[in-house]
């Protein structure tokens, strides 16, 4: 019988008492084969973290700063359940740390030196740790003691709880630096008042502070937020302009064998029976013998943290950067106006080899990081382990939902002004063998399908989106008799046709021979009835253009396109017979890397782009013999996006809507994790 006990860690006598009450009340409402609570008492949160890591306890609820400690080796804990605030309809699990300024003050984030600052309190998250952590490498050296460095950075501050004797500048705007509400500039409202009164130029608070202190929109419009990209935004655009997104209070558990499903089962049942307004005799979110015992008193319930989400992703890049800077106190030696090498994310060993060759030729401008799937790469870019990669539109959508931005677009047509003219897109098509003359768009049910990969534009999102509108369910593996759609569940019929050996079968990378455009076409040639690819795929792999044994004798005339009206047309008539127009592949990165990625990639394409004529004797960025490694092989250049610099603007309303509709069919664990952070 599996042990269904969750050992909860308590950090005080009062918590232990509430834990015992929690245990007893859960016993009374949950069947004997359901989850149960046991209580473990430790002296501190750090002791609880160590106990969970050592398998002496299973769960504890932590503030964001401690979630970071819990994640660090050797603890390796992960977030499993989040408390939420507000209503069930609009649950808030995060708050945003922001920098508020007056509208007419005219400076940006990178011009804070010499300004006057208002903080909620020394050592507090939104008011100190996050802003000072993010500004850490701009502080004058020596950076220790930190208070002295901050005092020398700003021309005056109010940082309640600071030592006014040793660091008088930190108390210049609020004499005495009192550490309670007796100091009018203490806490969130106090820091905002410090700005409002004109004592300071910037207040470091949370996003709700301004709304709680100014009910009138006209008053709020006198203020703006400083964004990390050195722009400003209105105060209600905090989701796109903040210093960090911070989880409020989170249950953590072991990453391996951490009982996360059991913890969720326990807490979900607990909130049903003892949540807000559920029971008089025991209340989960109430602390008669103290404050915030086990859970925050202000919490309204729990939400399960998606399993794909580790602590780094949950806390977010900005928060982790700020806390790491403060804890480790290390800053890059390079001058900040110089671009560091761009860490390119390469999928599996084929891409890694090409990336390595690029790295050698770039003489240090490009470095390479490997991952097994596109989603793993996106996650690495999110958390700073990698910086950039080029993505199909379907993954540009996921990357965008995860906070990344497009920087340059692949262009596939030769033109005089290639780099300045991003194209409208390419065509997603359905290809069949000419010999299968009875096959049309209307009778694909039961046929064998070949897809570039799950989540990609031409191979999945467009054809499956159209199919979904017809069949109104997500069981595509039942619609087709079998197929190869790399990235599907291994036991799915949509992996049956794939050719990868062993663990590589149906993997969404080049270790699976039927992956990508060329792979999906090969799947059609060798096993399938229909392939969902781009309009250039057939000509690129026929007429001897692909020398691989399976392709060298193929003839374009032996293939036809399925049109949505039920007719068929020759391959060259793709403009009048396609499923939809697809946005070109695009390079994505984090917002903070946007300028450097743009600059370095433009330099790199001038050195190694399509202007290089002899690819046998020189490195060519856009060539890999039909394998589309790092970039599509038919890329002519990487083009500026001009104002299409967000994923929505880049992909276009129609495509975003189409992918949005398919979301209910999504198996993307990363998309689930990212929409948890930003619904």
């Amino acid at each position: 019988v599996p042990d269904k006990t969750v050992r909860w860690c308590a950090v005080s006598e009062h918590e232990a008492t509430k834990c015992q009450s929690f245990r007893d009340h859960m016993k009374s409402v949950i069947p004997s084969d359901g989850p149960s609570v046991a209580c473990v008492k430790k002296a501190s949160y750090l002791d609880c973290i160590r106990a969970i890591a050592a398998n002496e306890a299973d769960a504890v609820t932590l503030d964001a700063g401690l979630v970071y400690d819990a994640y660090l080796a050797p603890n390796n804990l992960k977030p499993v359940v989040a408390e939420f605030y507000g209503s069930k309809e609009d649950p808030q699990t995060f708050y945003y740390a922001v920098a508020v300024v007056k509208k007419d003050s005219g400076f940006q984030m990178n011009q804070l030196r010499g300004k006057k600052s208002c903080h909620t309190g020394l050592g507090r998250s939104a008011g100190w740790n996050i802003p000072i952590g993010l500004l850490y490498c701009d502080l004058p050296e020596p950076r220790k003691p930190l208070e002295k460095a901050v005092a020398n950075f700003f021309s005056g501050s109010c940082a309640p709880c600071a030592d006014g004797t040793d660091f008088p500048q930190l108390c210049q705007l609020c004499p005495g630096c009192g550490c309670s509400t007796l100091n009018q500039y203490f806490g969130y409202s106090g820091a905002f008042k410090c700005l409002k009164d004109g004592a300071g130029d910037v207040a470091f608070v949370k996003h709700s502070t301004i709304f709680e202190n100014l009910a009138n929109k006209a008053d709020r419009d006198q203020y703006e937020l400083l964004c990390l990209d050195n722009t400003r935004k209105p105060v209600d655009e905090y989701k796109d302009c903040h210093l960090a997104q911070v989880p409020s209070h989170t249950v953590v558990a072991r990453s391996m064998g951490g009982k996360e499903d059991l913890i969720w089962e326990l807490l979900n049942q607990a909130q049903e029976h003892f949540g807000k307004d559920k029971s008089k005799e025991f209340q989960l979110f109430s602390s008669p013998h103290g404050k915030d015992l086990l859970f925050k008193d202000s919490a309204h319930g729990f939400l399960k943290v998606p399993p794909r989400m580790d602590a780094k992703m949950y806390l977010g890049y900005e928060y982790v950067t700020a806390i790491r800077n403060l804890r480790e106190g290390t800053c890059p030696e390079a001058p900040t106006d110089e671009c560091k090498p761009v860490k390119w994310c390469a999928l599996s060993h084929h891409e890694r080899l090409k990336c390595d060759e690029w790295s050698v030729n770039s003489v240090g401008k490009i470095e390479c990081v490997s991952a097994e799937t596109t989603e793993d790469c996106i996650a690495k870019i999110m958390n700073g382990e990698a910086d950039a990669m080029s993505l199909d539109g379907g993954f540009v959508y996921i990357a965008g939902k995860c906070g990344l931005v497009p920087v340059l677009a692949e262009n596939y047509n030769k033109s005089d002004n290639c780099e300045d003219t991003p194209e409208a897109g390419y065509f997603a098509i359905a290809v069949v063998k000419k010999s299968a003359s009875d096959l049309t768009w209307d009778n694909l049910k039961g046929k064998k399908s070949c897809h570039t990969a799950v989540g990609r534009t031409a191979g999945w999102n467009i054809p499956m989106g159209l199919l979904y509108n017809k069949i109104n369910h997500c069981r595509f593996d039942e619609f087709f008799s079998e197929g190869c759609a790399p990235g599907s569940k291994k036991d799915s019929s949509l992996c049956k046709l794939c050719m990868g050996s062993g663990l590589n079968l149906c993997e969404p990378n080049n270790k699976e021979g039927y992956y990508g455009y060329t792979g999906a076409f090969r799947c059609l040639v060798e096993k399938g009835d229909v392939a969902f690819v781009k309009h250039q795929t057939v000509p690129q792999n026929t007429g001897g253009k692909n020398p691989d044994p399976w392709a060298k004798n193929l003839n374009e005339k032996d293939y036809e396109l399925l049109c949505l009206d039920g007719t068929r047309k020759p391959v060259e008539e793709y403009a009048n017979c396609h499923l939809a127009r697809a946005p070109n592949h695009a390079v994505v990165t984090r917002k903070d890397k946007e300028a450097c990625v743009h600059k370095i990639l433009r330099q790199q394409q001038h050195l190694f782009g399509s202007n290089v004529t002899d690819c046998s004797g020189n490195f060519c960025l856009f060539r890999s013999e039909t394998k589309d490694l790092l970039f599509r092989d038919d890329t002519v250049c990487l083009a500026k996006l001009h104002d299409r610099n967000t994923y929505e603007k880049y992909l276009g309303e129609e495509y975003v809507k189409a992918v949005g509709n398919l979301r209910k069919c999504s198996t993307s664990s990363l998309l689930e994790a990212c929409t948890f952070r930003r619904p």
């Epitope: 891409e351 080899l353 050698v360 046998s616 490195f619 060539r623 890999s624 013999e625 394998k627």
Partner: nanobody, 117 residues
Framework: QVKLEESGGGLVQPGGSLRLSCAAS????????MAWYRQAPGKQRELVAG???????NYRDSVKGRFTISRDNAKNTMYLQMNSLKPEDTAVYYC???????????WGQGTQVTVSS
Amino acid sequence: QVKLEESGGGLVQPGGSLRLSCAASGSIFSIATMAWYRQAPGKQRELVAGITRSGSTNYRDSVKGRFTISRDNAKNTMYLQMNSLKPEDTAVYYCTDYSSRYYHDYWGQGTQVTVSS
């Protein structure tokens, strides 16, 4: 694709030196980029150093200042001079030439380098 063969490995004490050679069966004059990789037991294969046709070189951070890559197009050979060797340099060392543009994962036998006292 030219055939490549590595040699020059051996057992050496920490602080010692070795020179690895990579001999090509055909001309390497037109090969765009050549490189040395290494693979320690239980670890991923990693790029150590690379050299372009024009002689530009690039090194992984942990070997910068200790290792030097060079190529002699006349002798159709590439070299890796390894000085101040450390125990963590212990691995099988492979050379590659990327020339096919297929980026297939084909590797020779490699040459074993062991740094131990």
